[in-house]
Every structure is written in C-alpha cells, then in structure tokens.
Interface confidence: low
C-alpha cells in the first residue's frame, strides 16, 4: 500500500552580508523601530532567497534575530521540512552552496529578483551552519537580554553585566574580519551558581560550544577563551539571585598566532625549551593546528615531552579527541587533563626528526597546553631510577613506595628500601652505608664514600649534578659533595635552648621553633612550619572552603607556645601570598600542601627558626620515631589545646598503611602512628609538622598533618603529606 513519506525538521543557522546597508546602534536595541523594520525587510528577503531555490518546497519558517557590522550583517535561522531519506543530502554545506549559487546567478541580472529589491547580498559572505530545535529554543530564551557588541582592533571592551531580572542573557560579539576574539572571564565572587557558555558562532549552537564554566571557580579564577575567528557568543544562565555580578567579562580582538616551529635540539639531557598553544595560558581556539618539527642530534637519543597536568592517551580511532588531538610519528593520541605530571617518550629511529601535530578536533576546547621538550638516552632512559611506562616518568625504584601506578617500581626488588651488598646480595639498612663501619661481608657499603657515584634512588645529588653514595648527607657537618653543597643552607632544624596532640605532652618555649599557628580572626585554624625566611608550609586542605581562600584573613604566629597568651619571643605576620599545590585534589587529599609567603622576613631568634627541608632522595626509614606538634584537639571531637603539644610517632611502611586505608594512600603520602592508636594528630593539627631528627641533631621535615580516620584509633595511622614527594614544587616556589 501507499506509505506516507516521513518528514523531519532540519534547522540551519547562519549569517549573510548586505553590501548596500550600514549597521547602526539602533539595530542593537530589539525594541527600536529601526530594528523592527529592518527585521521585517531582512526576513522577507531571506524567505524569498530560500524559496527561489529548490529548497523552496521544503521551506517551513525563518527568523532574523540580530544584526552586526560589516557593512550590515544579518544573523538568522530557518527550518526546512525534509523527507527523512534526503536529510543527509541537505547538509549545511549543500544548502550554503545552493543559496550561493542562486545569489551568483542574479549578480549581473537585470531582471527583477524579489530578494534583491532592497538588499544587495554578498554571495561570499553567506555562512550556513547546522543547528537544532533545542538551539533555537536556547536562543529565543535569551532574546529578552540580548547584547551585541563590536570590538575594534586594539580595543579591550568590558562587557556590561547581565540583567539580573532575566534568567538568561546573550552577548553577541564581533571583531574585525581577519582577527580572532579573545574573551576574558574573571569570577569576582567567592561563590555563585551561574553558568556561562562560550560559542564559536553568533548564537548558542551546541555543536559549536567552545567551553562552559559553572560557579565561581577558585581553581580557575580567570579564564581566557579564544574563538576561531571574529565572531563569538556568550550565554549566561542565572544561578542564585545576586545584586552583584559574579563575574567580569571583557573581549579583545587578537591576531592569529602561527603555531609552527622547526627546532634542532642540543646534545644534552635535560629540558631544552617549551612549546605551547597560541596565547597560552588562554584556552586554545577551535580549529587550532600546531605543527612542531624537532630534529634530534643523534639516534642515541629519544625525544621526551614533559606535560604539566595533561597526559596523552590512545583513543579508538573513530572517537574524536575532546581535549586535543596529537599525532606523533603518525600515531594518533588524545589529550586528557589530569592532576599529575606526565611525560611522553618518543623513540627516534631516523635522523629526519620528529613532527608533532596538535589539533583541536572539535569546537569544544580547554585550557592552553604547554609542553617542555628535551632528550633522553634511549639505552638508559632513567639512570639509577625506574621508567614508569604508565606516565613516562622516572621514579625511584625499590624505595618502599609504589611511585608508578602499576607498582612495577617496587616489583622484583632484591633489597627494598635497604642497601644491597655487592658480595652476596644481603640487605643492610641505609643509615649503615658510609657510616665508617663495614657491615657487608667485604665492606662494599663503605666503598666509594669519598667520591662521586652514579645517581640512584638513595644517592644525594649535589649542586654540580654529581651524586654521593652516603644517604641523607645534608647538614651533618661533613662535606660529602665536591662542591660542599650538602652543607649549604644549613641554618635550620636546631631547637632553641629548651628549659596536646592525642597522647602528647606540653612543649616548652623554643623547643619547636619552626612551629606556626595559622589563625583567622584570632582563632587557631591550622598548624604549619617555617621553612625559609619568608615561607611557611602547611596543608592545602586548610583553605578548602571558599571563605578561607583570601590571604587577608590569615595571621601567622611563630614562636608561640600558648594560645591564650603572648610571650616576648612570639611574632605575628600577615600573608602576602598563598599558593596551593597545583595538583592538590580535595577528595583524595593528594598533594595536600600549601605555601604561605609572609609579609616580611622573619628575624631569627631562639624561638623562631626554620626546620630543614629534605632532599628528594632523603630516606625516612619506616620504624623511625619522629615527632608531631600542634594545638589540635586532645581527643577526637574535643576543643583545641591551649598549649603546644608534642607526641612521638613511628613511621609506618607504605604497603601496610595502604592496606589499612584500602589503597587510598598515594606516593605523596606518608603514614605514622601505632597499631594500638592513642598517639596521633587531631583536628586543629592539620598542616603542622612531622619532624625527624637526623644523626647530626638537626630536625628534618618529613610530613605535614593531612588526614586519617578519627584520632588515635587502633589500627588507623595518621596520614601525612610526604615532603620528599612535593619537594621539587616547594623548592621551585621558595627559590
């Protein structure tokens, strides 16, 4: 029998340029008579143009919703009712071609063409894009609060805030033809629920979304977004009612930045430079295409790309990359934002060099990407360390901590976290190495103690990049490095002349001169430790709440013992800068470390001195008794202590602690306490120091109070931020 043809609605959005009309400010106001009359004429012209082609039989409806510069640009949408089987045949490209063909056919025609009665339409200025009914609904919901702005070259235009009586607003932005728009969003309130979506076209087309941001993000207080060209739309959706704009928007046109480079690398094994997407740290734009060609000096080397908070992953070929597509040596990889470092190692097999392409495969983009590049030795990629194939990083091997996510760095270890004697592969504890007493059968633990050795997991790296065999040689009063750098920066870790954490005891003045009390409006919130003349280290989670993120709130007290009274050795500081570790993750407590820059340098005294910072290779041996200090609660759920408490805790092997906490313990964490509980940190101790005394009598910072289950509970140890796991970031900031 006869089967009715199934018809579907196909929505198109677009713009066209009118050469014999000029844009005026009146056309930005939808309520003006100029806007109404121009819309009526443009709408008529658009309908006539469509119906002049073979698309006319499918015409359903159309609307001109806005105007812009150039001399006059009309922005519109229209709907065609198409037989389902023909839908793919009427793609936006096909529809555009049909309309352009129609326009070209009448350019020199003397015949009266209805759509040319008033308008001279530029065939080259016609753009047709795919849209949806949902897009049109989204557009219509903003028309009560629709703002058009043209921004000229060299201008930075601050956009007027949204109309708070509306629930949604749209800023339609346009710039000079051959430039691209850069939008800057700055959140101005601590908290909000607003949503902003940026599009690479004049209206809210879902398929052309560049990015959307929610709430007043503290992680990204400022966001810069690049469009692929001179047109952009920003849609605001109201969150909580507020009389204050929770954000400031500004826009400027910028020139296209070439993203192509040819480089020849030097014969050395470290970072040699940086590659980045245009206008980094701005979001990369849709249609970004970068091509970097790197030439390697010899086939002994491979090329390493070190990423920060971004990784490359293989993706099934048919799936698009949502966070950037990379092709390296004809291998397709997808970018992925992560809160970890990552390296991609590229073996070199030909002297022709390596081409790296980065492409934004879809209109959805993300923060600009930056990568450090350098060489590695193909035969020994990680001298003295283990190459973690999961993330391309060199990690310490057999040190008792699973640094590699798959744990292979701790597999097949003859001696874990100990020294392996050459003679018979017996294992001796690290403090026995180079201590002047032979412990191995033929004394191999005491060999090469006065000379440089290949760098490895437990060797100390001197400033001249050479390594020494003696473990933990820092500040022990004996120069072990040729350049003496192991004895530099040693004005630290000494207690003053000394006359409650759970299970603790009261400390005396000057006993823990690095201890800090971090206070808000006179109330102790967290502990911390002085590590340099102007820097205090603490836990990032102390600043988790938005209300705690402002430096002006905080006062740092040093030399303090009693919370309710002052004594002459006590000093207070304001905070000039607060830096959270860029990889800090609230949920997992990973990288739980923050640095506070004091408003002025400390004047050292018996009561105020920094603690020593360990080198990355410093080994804090499980079983070692160390101390935690703070004004935290003396029992779970109790009030904070008036007196500075101290308590000894034992360092716990990582695998044991990891088991207790169901494998939530990362390599940036360290556990301390006792099986039976009792002695532990508690609320209010957060950020405070876990310190261990070296043989030299100096105290080294091993950890920061981070998290744990309750306080002093049996079988649940305290979990601390492992300082050796974050030391490179600390040093980078402090120096």
């Amino acid at each position: 029998g006869y089967k009715a043809e199934v018809m579907v609605s196909q929505v198109y959005s677009g713009s066209l340029r009118v050469l014999n009309r000029h844009f005026s400010q009146d056309l930005t106001r939808r309520e003006s008579s100029a806007f109404r009359s121009e819309t009526a004429k443009a709408q008529k012209m658009l309908k006539e143009l469509i119906t002049s082609t073979r698309l006319g039989t499918y015409y359903n409806s159309s609307s001109v919703y806005s105007f812009g510069e150039g001399p006059l640009t009309c922005f519109f949408w229209f709907i065609l009712q198409i037989p389902e089987h023909r839908r793919l045949m009427l793609s936006p490209e096909v529809v555009q071609a049909l309309l352009v063909e129609e326009l070209l056919s009448t350019v020199n025609s003397s015949a009266a063409v209805p759509y040319r009665a008033e308008y001279e339409v530029d065939p080259e200025g016609l753009v047709i894009l795919e849209a949806s009914v949902k897009d049109i609904a989204a557009l219509n919901s903003t028309l009560g609060c629709y703002r058009y702005s043209y921004v000229g070259q060299g201008q930075v235009l601050r956009l007027k805030g949204p109309d708070h009586l509306a629930s949604s607003c749209l800023w339609h932005l346009q710039g000079p033809k051959d430039l691209m728009l850069k939008l800057r969003l700055e959140w101005t309130l601590a908290e909000c629920r607003d949503r902003l979506a940026m599009y690479d076209v004049a209206g809210p087309l879902e398929k052309r979304l560049i990015t959307s941001v929610y709430g007043c993000s503290r992680q990204e207080p400022v966001v810069e977004v690049l469009a692929s060209g001179a047109i952009m739309a920003v849609v605001w959706k109201k969150g909580l009612h507020s009389y204050y704009d929770p954000f400031v928007l500004s826009v400027q046109p910028v020139v296209f930045q070439a993203c192509e480079v040819n480089l020849t690398l030097d014969n050395r094994l470290d970072s040699q430079g940086v590659l980045s997407t245009p206008y980094f740290p701005s979001y990369y734009s849709p249609q970004t295409h970068c091509s970097w060609h790197l030439t390697v000096p010899s086939l002994d080397y491979g090329l390493a790309l070190w990423f920060d908070a971004y990784a490359l992953r293989r993706q099934k070929y048919d799936l698009p990359c949502t966070q950037g597509q990379w092709t390296i040596q004809n291998r397709r990889l997808c970018g992925l934002r992560i809160l970890q470092p990552y390296a991609e190692r590229i073996p070199v097999v030909a002297t022709a060099g390596i081409t790296i392409n980065f492409t934004s495969q879809i209109s959805l983009t993300g923060p600009g990407v930056r990568v450090h590049y350098g060489l590695y030795n193909q035969s020994d990629p990680c001298p003295g360390e283990f190459l973690c194939s999961v993330n391309g990083l060199c990690v310490p091997a057999c040190d008792g901590v699973k640094d590699c996510p798959n744990g292979l760095d701790e597999r097949n270890c003859v001696c874990r976290a100990t020294f392996q004697c050459k003679e018979d592969s017996t294992c001796i504890s690290l403090p026995k190495v180079c201590d002047g007493q032979p412990d191995c059968l033929n004394g191999s633990d005491e060999e090469q103690c006065q000379e440089g050795v290949p760098c490895g997991t437990f060797t100390f790296q001197c400033e001249d990049r050479s390594c020494v065999k003696k473990p933990n040689p820092q500040c022990d009063g004996r120069p072990d490095c040729r350049d003496g750098s192991d004895e530099e920066h040693c004005d630290c870790g000494l207690q003053g002349p000394s006359s409650r954490i759970v299970g603790g005891a009261v400390s005396s003045e000057g006993e823990w001169p690095w201890q800090a009390s971090l206070q808000v409006r006179g109330r102790h919130i967290c502990g911390g430790a002085l590590i340099a003349d102007r820097w205090v280290i603490t836990a990032a989670h102390c600043f988790q709440e938005d209300s705690m993120a402002s430096t002006v709130l905080w006062t740092v007290f040093l030399g303090k013992v009693w919370q309710n009274s002052r004594w002459p050795g006590e000093v207070s500081f304001k905070v000039s800068r607060l830096l959270l570790h860029p990889y800090h993750e609230e949920d997992s407590h990973d990288y739980d470390v923050a640095l506070l820059q004091l408003d002025h340098p400390v004047v050292r005294s018996a009561a105020v001195r920094p603690v020593c910072l360990p080198a990355r290779s410093h080994f804090f041996e499980p079983g070692l008794h160390c101390w935690i200090t703070g004004w935290g609660a003396l029992r779970e759920g109790g009030p904070i202590s008036n007196a500075l408490q101290k308590v000894d805790v034992q360092l716990i092997p990582q695998d044991l602690c990891s088991e207790v906490y169901r494998y939530q313990v990362t390599p940036r964490m360290l556990c301390a306490g006792y099986r039976k509980g009792k002695k532990d940190a508690c609320q209010g101790d957060s950020g405070g120091p876990l310190v261990c005394k070296a043989l030299s009598g100096r105290w080294f910072l091993a950890g920061l109070v981070s998290w744990g289950l309750g306080c002093g509970r049996p079988n649940y140890f305290g979990v601390y931020t492992r300082i050796t796991g974050v030391i490179s970031w600390i040093q980078q900031v402090v120096t």
Epitope: S250, Q519, G522, S550, V552, T555, K574
Partner: antibody, heavy 118, light 107 residues
Amino acid sequence: QVQLQQPGAELAKPGASVKMSCKASGYTFTSYWITWVKQRPGQDLEWIGNIYPGSGSTYYNEKFKSKATLTVDTSSRTAYMQLSSLTSADSAVYYCAPYDSDYAMDYWGQGTSVTVSS
Amino acid sequence: DIKMTQSPSSMYASLGERVTITCKASQDINNYLSWFQQKPGKSPKTLIYRANRLVDGVPSRVSGSGSGQDYSLTISSLEYEDVGIYFCLQYDEFPLTFGAGTKLELK
C-alpha cells in the same frame, strides 16, 4: 553607610608626640584592616602601615617603623596612630581607610592635618 | 618594594576629550591596582579597584584596564568634574606603593 571620622587638625611642637584617632562606623570594624596614609602638601601619597582590629596585628612600612605606632580600641571602634619625635617633615595630612585585600581602600577618612611648629 | 611609575605627571585636556593615564609596576602585580582621584583639600576618592572594576557611583565614562605590569585609566569623554590629581596604588604586596600622581587640568 561606611564612615571614618578624623579630627581636622593637630598642632604639635618639634620633638613631641601626637596621637590621632579614626572612628569607624557602618561596617564590621574587626573584619577589615585599617590603613594609614601620609600626604605632604603638594606631594604624593605614602603608605604608613596597616592594623588588623580583629587581632591587633600590625604591618608597617619600614620607613615609618620607628615613627608611627598603630593601635585600636575595638569597644569604641576607633583606630589610633601615634607619631613620635616630631619634626617639620612630619607636617602632613594623615588619612585612615578600611583596607581589604580585594578592594584596597574604597572609603577614606577626611584626613587629619598635622602641623609641627615651635 | 614594588615601584609604581605613573605618567604623565601632568596634562591638559579639553571637555569631551578622551584621556588616558598609565601606571607601570616594577613587577607583575596580578591586577591588584586601584585608581584614585583627589581634588584640592579633599581626601582621595576611589574610582577603580582590581585594575578594571568600577566602584559604585563612579560614572561609566571612567574605565580601567591592563594586566601584568602595565595598567591604564581612561576617561572616555572629559567632564568638568574630572579635573584633579589621579593616583594609582598597587596592593599585590606589602608595602603598598602609590604612583606619583597625574595632575589633570582643563585646556
């Protein structure tokens, strides 16, 4: 609304001290710093220091450390600045203002004109 | 200390003219910059904070822009009441430091 009341003028002899006041109203006094600024006739502005009424914590410009002492009385919502060992170089208008790390000084007192003369 | 270099030190402009004053910091001040206007015998009046945010009640012809070390204050169309001395202030770091001021007078 936010207001800061300062006495209009103070006269003092060289070598003496002067203590000026700044009474705040219209906002939570203990939650914002009070900042003090000096302006000599026809000259630019110089920051003297800040005091945080919530804790009494102070921060001084090195240049004014031995010259100015900042204090507060939270019960009367008043901040004070004492200038000691006065010389003619201390003749100036001194302003107080609430200070916030985001807005800096968005309200200012009317200023106290100090004249040091024998 | 962060040094703020303000220019010009003085300028003449006509009513309706566009006026721009600049301040350069000796290091990146992360947009922590305020602009003040002062009239003879009066206390300073804050116009802009965080480099580009207008204080309530300040006319929209006044705007601030810039980032990093370079900042500017623009009056799009000068009016009689805009005459006075303009100062910038960095408050990214203690000690707070001011620019030396720009005296704006009518031509």
